[in-house]
Structures are given as structure tokens and as C-alpha cells.
Amino acid sequence: RKIPKVGHTFFQKPESCPPVPGGSMKLDIGIINENQRVSMSRNIESRSTSPWNYTVTWDPNRYPSEVVQAQCRNLGCINAQGKEDISMNSVPIQQETLVVRRKHQGCSVSFQLEKVLVTVGCTCVTPVIHHVQ
Amino acid sequence: GITIPRNPGCPNSEDKNFPRTVMVNLNIHNRNTNTNPKRSSDYYNRSTSPWNLHRNEDPERYPSVIWEAKCRHLGCINADGNVDYHMNSVPIQQEILVLRREPPHCPNSFRLEKILVSVGCTCVTPIVHHVA
């Protein structure tokens, strides 16, 4: 899947664009909004009716090296009495993000963009029930 | 930056960390090509904290289309199908990395950008405080 070229309907390519070899692109990995932080203080992963845990995956050949994945704690959802209700389902909510993958081929190094599917949290859903005919 | 293991047989590189600027293959390695959450599941409708999905489009960004969730209700849907306002629907937010064209409008020059997106909603139990 290639990154789409800038459409001429939007704008013309400026003269100031850096020269880039064919089949590749220049990527500055100094992140814009690097210091932006999600407010994790809300602690919703424990207070949700479909609670979840976090696991940190670490890969030294990936940028960023740390990716946090959520896993639903229960199959069912937590009811008002604090008990698990198996008639409902805790399900993962997922979101794609981009990472840069570093690949070693002998002594040379190349970089590849990769889409990674991250499980962000869980939500409680009503299942669609099918009875035997 | 991050430290990476070097092949001991290779000449010493000047930096063990990721360089600030890299040349990247235009092809994105990925199995998950479905970026429209409406097609991937109907959780947004069947959740006890359902949400609507809003399309955010920006031609200067890759991916140019990002779907943002907005909780449909303040409360959560109970077993009777009614909204229970003693519970709360809250957004689940996630920081993701996208590509920003830099300089602007350039077809093959980008910078990583971190953005905060609401991915969906979950139902939470509040701590209740009655008047003393």
C-alpha cells in the first residue's frame, strides 16, 4: 500500500521540496507534539464495566520501541453488583498507528513504515443471539 | 532515540540510535488495510456506551482520513435498552503516529506527528458523593 501522491486538485508541488530517490521518501522522526500526553489519571481501565490490563511490548528495531497493548480482563461485563455477567461481552477496541521498522540486511540498514494494530481498551457489547432452528 | 544491536562483524556505526532523518520505502508494510471502523465491527452500535464515528480528513497528513469517536450518550444503555445516567459513557483515547507533509504540500517528505484520537467509548461506574 503506497502513500498517495499529493493530488493536483489540492495544490502544486512547491519548488522547495527536498530531492528524494525514486521509490522512497524522506522521513523526519523528530515527533511533532512529542510532549503531548493522554491523561491516564482517569484510570478508566479499572473502572470500566469491561475492564482491561496493559502490556508493554518492546522492540529495539522499531520506532517507537515501546507499544502498549490492552487486554480485556473478562469475557463478560461487570454488573452493578460487581459480578461478571456472561450474557454480555467485553470486546477490544482497536486503532491503527504507524511505526518505523529498522531492517538489517548484512551490514546495511533500511527503514520501512509499518501499520500496527493497537488494542486501546475494551467496551461492553450486547451479543447478537442466534437460537437453533 | 533507541539503542539497536549491531552486527559485530560490521564496521562501527556513528550512532546506535535511530537517526533523526531516514529514507523510507514508499510501500507501507501492513496486513491491516481496513481503516474504516464502521466496516470492521458494529461494536459502536452494540456497546452499552455506543458512539458515533466522525470523519476527519486532512490531505497534508497520512493517513488522510481518521475516524473520531464521540459518545452518543452521557449515561450507558441498561438491560432494558434505556439510558442509565447513574453510569457514564466516556471516550477511550489513544496517541497515534501519523505522517505530516513537511515542508507542506511536498509529495515525498514527511515528519512523524503524534495525535490524540478518541477510538471508542466505554462505560464506567462513578464514585458517588451524597450531600453531607
Epitope: 489519571s41 | 464521540k70 452521557l74 457514564n88 464514585i127 458523593h129
Partner: nanobody
Framework: EVQLVESGGGLVQPGGSLRLSCAAS????????MGWFRQAPGKERDFVAA????????FYADSVKGRFTISRDNAKNAVYLQSNSLKSEDTAVYVC?????????????WGRGTQVTVSS
């Protein structure tokens, strides 16, 4: 802690109007929502209307839609309930609430309530 002070209740004739006010003070820097429930004698406390702080979206119980309007004043951290075309079944104690994000949890705070009586 968050304190809620309601005002504006009273006796009104059927078809009349009232404007209820609720002002929040204390740790209200991260309000999620504010609104109103009501409780008639011998009945459960029922949701009336609320407003979400992040985007100003308003939510109403079916029984008051088209007659009641909720609004807010961000600077004063206050909500208002404009009640028109009042009916006898609107008689109740109207209780203000606020959902506030704390350091580790979302908290629901209740006010004392203000009496609304609709009678001729």
C-alpha cells in the same frame, strides 16, 4: 470536594415557567457533565436533563423534551434549567448533579435539591 448549590424552585401554576440554577464550586477543573434529576414523593430519582462539558451537547428525558432547555455558563461553572409549559406531574424535588474527573476516578456529586410544585 465539589459543592453544588441549587436555586429557582417554587410554586407555579400549570402552563407556567421556572428557571432553575445550579452553581458548582470546589475542584471543578475537569467537569465531565452537569445536569438535573428529579424525585417525586414515593418515586425513584429520575433523570431530567444534562449537558456534556467537552462539546456542549445536551440530553433530555423524553417526558421533558420540547418543554425544558438546559444551558451552561462555563465561566461560572453553572447550569440552568429553563422549564416551560409545566404540568402537575413535573412536581418534584429537582436535584443538581455534576460528574467530575478526579485524579483516579470519575466522581458524581449531588446537590441538596430545590422543590418545584406545579399546582393551581
Amino acid at each position: 470536594e465539589v459543592q453544588l448549590v441549587e436555586s429557582g424552585g417554587g410554586l407555579v401554576q400549570p402552563g407556567g415557567s421556572l428557571r432553575l440554577s445550579c452553581a458548582a464550586s470546589g475542584r471543578t477543573f475537569s467537569t465531565h457533565a452537569m445536569g438535573w434529576f428529579r424525585q417525586a414523593p414515593g418515586k425513584e430519582r429520575d433523570f431530567v436533563a444534562a449537558i456534556r462539558w467537552s462539546d456542549g451537547s445536551s440530553f433530555y428525558a423524553d417526558s421533558v423534551k420540547g418543554r425544558f432547555t438546559i444551558s451552561r455558563d462555563n465561566a461560572k461553572n453553572a447550569v440552568y434549567l429553563q422549564s416551560n409549559s409545566l404540568k402537575s406531574e413535573d412536581t418534584a424535588v429537582y436535584v443538581c448533579y455534576a460528574d467530575v474527573e478526579g485524579p483516579t476516578a470519575l466522581h458524581k456529586y449531588w446537590g441538596r435539591g430545590t422543590q418545584v410544585t406545579v399546582s393551581s
